[in-house]
Amino acid sequence: MMTGTIETTGNISAEKGGSIILQCHLSSTTAQVTQVNWEQQDQLLAICNADLGWHISPSFKDRVAPGPGLGLTLQSLTVNDTGEYFCIYHTYPDGTYTGRIFLEVLESSVAEHGARFQIP
């Protein structure tokens, strides 16, 4: 019954202090999307409900922005943001589709440049 597929941005990397867009796209199904949940491991980051719109979890309000579309923008990245992110599409009548993105947050280029000045 579940004919759809989730396409994601896959494994991505970004610099510490920067921002990144997490994107998923559901295709190959006629099912209707009623809600998309964004989660990091077991923590709920945000919800986009077809009727009620966006809700960002209070603990992430300062660093998470809704969109573009059903995607999610993470800002002011830290090394602790490295890890798995999941987009969970609730659809009728297919049920739940889940996509996975792995984000690696790298030390910024400023930190890398600093290494050049080390005494040999």
Partner: antibody
């Protein structure tokens, strides 16, 4: 108030067509899938199929293909069921029903129209 | 298609009685089950969804339980307005309804 209001009873001859309307109010029409359910006199409920109110894509249940067409007019928040080449066995009450719930286990038909009686008789 | 079998088909009971209606699925449907009440000449009304969650505005004497293939609807103390026909519905795949249970006054 959230409600679905259906068109009135119809008396049709075999071979004719009928179009039943279901007007939604009190909520965002395009955010909730719409279903159609048939109930023949003295019988149980039969799911006929549904229409994606966001894309307009219809899906018919087995046994309700060909003569049964689901459509929308989102500008007036209305879903339609058209039945062609009517037969005596199409005599039934037809209901539209909204799918409520955010997803997962929460899905259910939370709002129903009052029903439209379609009688097919020569 | 997933088949739902309701039992009993007919049930006679008195005001104040505790009644239980069973719904069995032909294959596992987890908790994707809803219960509806229908009175003559009226549209069905949602009572319970997700097998055990009471719909807003429905009296607490109604309760649902079960998971997998066997589910029950219980009315703890029948009221005069509860005499009606009850249907279960699965939403694990394309929806299907049980055959109904007609609850009559004894």
């Amino acid at each position: 108030e959230i409600q679905l209001v259906q068109s009135g009873s119809e008396l049709k001859k075999p071979g004719a067509s009928v179009k039943v309307s279901c007007k939604a109010s009190g909520y965002t029409f395009t955010s909730y899938p719409m279903n159609w359910v048939r109930q023949a006199p003295g019988q149980g409920l039969e799911w006929m199929g549904w229409i994606n109110t966001n894309t307009g894509n219809p899906t018919n249940a087995q046994g309700f293909t060909g003569r049964f067409v689901f459509s929308l007019d989102t500008s007036v928040s209305t879903a339609y069921l058209q039945i062609s080449s009517l037969k005596a066995e199409d005599t039934a009450v037809y209901y539209c029903a909204r799918v409520g719930g955010y997803g997962g286990y929460d899905y259910a038909f939370d709002i129903w129209g009052q029903g439209t009686m379609v009688t097919v008789s020569s | 298609d997933i088949q739902l079998t309701q039992s009993p088909s007919f049930l006679s009971a008195s005001v104040g009685d505790r009644v239980t209606i069973t719904c069995r699925a032909s294959q596992g449907i987890s908790s994707y089950l809803a219960w509806y009440q229908q009175k003559p000449g009226k549209a069905p009304k949602l009572l319970i969804y997700a097998a055990s969650t009471l719909q807003s505005g429905v009296p607490s004497r109604f309760s649902g339980s079960g998971s997998g293939t066997e589910f029950t609807l219980t009315i703890s103390s029948l009221q005069p307005e509860d005499f009606a026909t009850y249907y279960c519905q699965q939403l694990n795949s394309y929806p299907t309804f049980g055959g109904g249970t007609k609850l009559e006054i004894k």
